[in-house]
Amino acid sequence: MSITGISPITEYLASLSTYNDQSITFALEDESYEIYVEDLKKDEKKDKVLLSYYESQHPSNESGDGVDGKMLMVTLSPTKDFWLHANNKEHSVELHKSEKPLPDQAFFVLHNMHSNSVSFESKTDPGVFIGVKDNHLALIKVDSSENLSTENILFKLSETHHHHHH
């Protein structure tokens, strides 16, 4: 599953919430970031995440004609130089400081099971998605395409504005 371009084809600054409208928030604690899933008070500001979209060749098509079989990969960065990473050993989602080129653990395949929601599949562990578990983000194994509609792996993006990259 190779990324076809070094720079993203588009970027959005958006707040991220669960299917049940809980907010994904990021807090700096002891020099590392914690990720929380919580209900915000009415006037509380939502944290924003920079989503960078990359084109990627689908593995089954890499030897094909290249016309078909593209996927969108995203990286998610809530603050400068920090990106969400999949820790497949611990089944956890963590924020790590990284330099570009980002490691594969920072890339997630974008799914739209519904037009108004997205899911993020780990590039390094196909079939494993970012999901909500005990008010935290975790990696959740989805065993069949029917289960892709499970609410705990569905997220909503509330776009705040376009991010102009060069």
């Epitope: 084809i9 588009t10 959005y12 689908h58 078909d68 079989g69 593209k70 996927m71 969108l72 395949v109 974008l110 799914h111 739209n112 099971m113 519904h114 037009s115 395409s145 892709l148 509609s149 776009e159 504005h161 376009h162 991010h163 102009h164």
Partner: antibody
Framework: QVKLLQSGAALVKPGASVKMSCATS????????VSWVKQSHGKGLEWIGE????????NFNENFKGKATLTVDKSTSTAYMELSRLTSEDSAIYYC???????????????WGQGTLVTVSS | NIVMTQSPKSMSISVGDRVTMNCKAS??????LAWYQQKPGQSPKLLIY???NRYTGVPDRFTGGGYGTDFTLTINSVQAEDAAFYYC?????????FGGGTKVELR
Amino acid sequence: QVKLLQSGAALVKPGASVKMSCATSGFSFTDYWVSWVKQSHGKGLEWIGEIYPNSGADNFNENFKGKATLTVDKSTSTAYMELSRLTSEDSAIYYCTRGPYYYSTQIIFAYWGQGTLVTVSS
Amino acid sequence: NIVMTQSPKSMSISVGDRVTMNCKASQNVGNNLAWYQQKPGQSPKLLIYYASNRYTGVPDRFTGGGYGTDFTLTINSVQAEDAAFYYCQRIYNSPPTFGGGTKVELR
């Protein structure tokens, strides 16, 4: 290669319904969103709506809610659109389209069927 | 809904000319813009997506540019087969909307 083959032209009476098909081949049907687009002399190109065969989820342009119904038959990799309560305003060419990306709708139309001409006339 | 306005409505050009057409969005759409070419009796064909990305198989004489509300499609050294209608379309967000088109004809 990727193909979207649409059903033939239809002449229908006002008030009636019409159901058109879009038979696909050359790709994994369930993994791509399929959109429908209307082209008429009066209003140019208009997006009607989209459907994801995997989940059956759909999404419509408000202007076509109640007018268009989108369905799929996964066993034959075919998408369908039914238009109801037809008037002369519905006379147009209707295209089925598919985006460039697995799993994701960016509402980009990379592949198009040849179009189905619908004429509403008494 | 965001309105996409294309200009000019039509243009008459000669083979070898460099041609630029415009598309204006009524609100900021970032780089969420596609361009299509449609020849008489044919279905539209995707040329450019995300404002400046040439789709697979599209000749490199076609170039997209712009960001926010103002976009351009340039054809360098127009060929006879480029005579067609060209449409811009706002992508990514629902509902996507199309411009009214620019007709490019050969002198």
